[in-house]
Interface confidence: low
């Protein structure tokens, strides 16, 4: 008996053929010896099945002996043994029908499960094998899980269904719901702008829901809200702002956020986070301000930055042009005495400056300049 | 199962390119990432980097960054890796190699091309 | 990069007998998301491509023999074949493939006493 297999929604042409390649009579019939479609000369004639009005054939191919069964938007109840009896002869083709849909919704957030439901014909018992866009493998069998789902499993997952050494294929497309990146560091001198820019790293027509910006100050003891706003269709308003520090945000996305001015008690971590309408959970992204500044105070020149640095970042005091007079693994510097000149405060990762700021040293008799 | 075939020995003189191919088959090749691993003579042995076939991102190793470049073709079911301004320490055979079983644990790998780097 | 250190360089085993290589990785390579061990062994013969043995820290690949098994968690890993036999003579890497790039350890040479 030869096996067919197809997918839920499909067509399916199974095929039946005859010794005389001449147009001669034929049947197409069920298990229950239901008569699907047939011909009388060259007229298409229908039995009383429930394919009635999704049956075809190709008239055609009638002519050179061919006589197939087109069965369309293909059902998981279709799945049967149909029958095509030409010249007293029986073929049987048995037909199993496969669906394989993902759960409540393909656009999923970062984090959470995407659960593949197979659906497939009583008595059957497919293998399944999904590989995602970055190339892992998972198998299962009526259902499968991939948890903590990530930014790269965004794209079109594969999935073949295994039955009787015969397979069909399912392309899914899946689209994960996160931020572009899962955080960021921004690194400022104390009195700049600072740009904090939160880019999607997905597009839909409408986008909607509400989002907030909380901020643990390194200085402070606990977080506050820096800003709360809503999204519709991809506008932003702004629904309420702390007085201190005062944030402006883009109207547009990607959401964008300035601070006009970084100062030492704004150096911290936030999390902005959005909550998209009809979705349970969040997107999360976390940015990070690390401020620096240098001054002089009487005899002591000093370099300090806050913010959350990482341990390997190195600190240094140099006089431009010379080697670092100072240079440690911590997050304040100074040099006594520093002779005049332009020094400059370096916070640097494996020899990558993140971070400059240049402070003028006058002769002793005189006040420092900052440029 | 993929297969994965790669293309003969080559001789080349430092600083020259050299570029090495790897044809898959018997798979669905958009389904697979080929990364590229390389051993010298007696040596251990070196991952340089990846090629998606499903979309042709690419993922370098550092080290070789800037002088390798990798490529896919997917009319052939072929992937390309490039290595430029050649020197003695890259005599090695060069793998492709992919996964089937769990990402980047290599379950099919190429034959090995043998690139020799000489004066 | 995962520096991953293999001990010993070499081994002499008699046949029959047990042989023992350990990996060790410079940080973890145990997942949170899957609860798996990102690691994997391979036996690699002269003039040959490596062979994949074990992937997930513990898991045969299809068609290699039940002699070869893998085990540890986190940082510490181990490939044990319970009884060597003439054609295990190879050189055998670990390899952690949690972190990219992956990295690969210096090999271990097998060979009978």
């Known amino acids: 008996k030869k096996v067919v297999l197809g997918k839920k929604g499909d067509t399916v042409e199974l095929t039946c053929t005859a010794s005389q390649k001449k147009s001669i009579q034929f049947h197409w019939k069920n298990s229950n010896q239901i008569k699907i479609l047939g011909n009388q000369g060259s007229f298409l004639t229908k039995g009383p099945s429930k394919l009635n009005d999704r049956a075809d054939s190709r008239r055609s191919l009638w002519d050179q002996g061919n006589f197939p069964l087109i069965i369309k938007n293909l059902k998981i109840e279709d799945s049967d043994t149909y029958i095509c009896e030409v010249e007293d002869q029986k073929e049987e083709v048995q037909l199993l029908v496969f669906g394989l849909t993902a759960n409540s919704d393909t656009h999923l957030l970062q984090g959470q499960s995407l659960t593949l439901t197979l659906e497939s014909p009583p008595g059957s018992s497919p293998s399944v094998q999904c590989r995602s866009p970055r190339g892992k493998n998972i198998q299962g069998g009526k259902t499968l899980s991939v948890s903590q789902l990530e930014l790269q499993d965004s794209g079109t997952w594969t999935c073949t269904v295994l039955q009787n050494q015969k397979k069909v294929e399912f392309k899914i497309d899946i689209v994960v719901l996160a931020f572009q990146k899962a955080s960021s560091i921004v690194y400022k001198k104390e009195g700049e702008q600072v740009e904090f820019s939160f880019p999607l790293a997905f597009t839909v027509e409408k986008l909607t829901g509400s989002g907030e910006l909380w901020w643990q100050a390194e200085r402070a003891s606990s977080s506050k809200s820096w800003i709360t706003f809503d999204l519709k269709n991809k506008e932003v308003s702004v629904k309420r702002v702390t007085q201190d520090p005062k944030l402006q945000m883009g109207k547009k996305l990607p959401l964008h956020l300035t601070l006009p001015q970084a100062l030492p008690q704004y150096a911290g971590s936030g999390n902005l986070t959005l909550a998209l309408e009809a979705k349970t959970g969040k997107l999360h992204q976390e940015v990070n301000l690390v401020v620096m500044r240098a001054t002089q105070l009487q005899k002591n020149l000093t370099c300090e930055v806050w913010g959350p640095t990482s341990p390997k970042l190195m600190l240094s005091l140099k006089l431009e042009n010379k080697e670092a007079k100072v240079s440690k693994r911590e997050k304040a510097v100074w040099v006594l005495n520093p002779e005049a000149g332009m020094w400059q405060c370096l916070l640097s990762d494996s020899g990558q400056v993140l971070l400059e700021s240049n402070i003028k040293v006058l002769p002793t008799w005189s006040t420092p300049v900052q440029p | 199962q993929v297969q994965l075939v790669q293309s003969g020995a080559e001789v080349k003189k430092p600083g020259a390119s050299v570029k090495v191919s790897c044809k898959a088959s018997?798979?669905?090749?958009?389904?697979?990432?080929i990364s590229w691993v390389r051993q010298a003579p007696g040596q251990g042995l070196e991952w340089m980097g990846w090629?998606?076939?499903?979309?042709?991102?690419?993922n370098y190793a550092q080290k070789f960054q800037g002088r390798v470049t990798m490529t896919r073709d997917t009319s052939t079911s072929t992937v390309y890796m490039e290595l430029s301004s050649l020197r003695s320490e890259d005599t090695a055979v060069y793998y492709c190699a992919s996964s089937d079983v769990s990402p980047d644990a290599f379950d099919i790998w190429g034959q090995g091309t043998t690139v020799t780097v000489s004066s | 990069d995962i520096v991953m250190t293999q001990s010993p360089d070499s081994l002499a085993v008699s046949l029959g007998e047990r042989a023992t290589i350990n990996c060790k990785s410079s940080q973890s390579v145990l997942s949170s998301s899957y609860n798996k061990n990102f690691l994997a062994w391979y036996q690699q013969k002269p003039g040959q491509p490596p062979k994949l043995l074990i992937y997930?820290?513990?898991t045969r690949e299809s068609g290699v023999p039940d002699r070869f098994s893998g085990s540890g968690s986190g940082t510490d890993f181990t490939l044990t074949i319970s009884s060597l036999q003439a054609e295990d003579v190879a050189v055998y890497y670990c390899?952690?493939?949690?972190?990219?790039?992956?990295?690969f350890g210096q090999g271990t040479k097998v060979e009978i006493k």
């Open positions: 390899q952690q493939y949690y972190s990219a790039p992956p990295t």
């Open positions: 018997g798979g669905t090749f958009s389904s697979y990432a």
């Open positions: 997930w820290a513990s």
């Open positions: 090629i998606s076939g499903y979309n042709g991102n690419t």
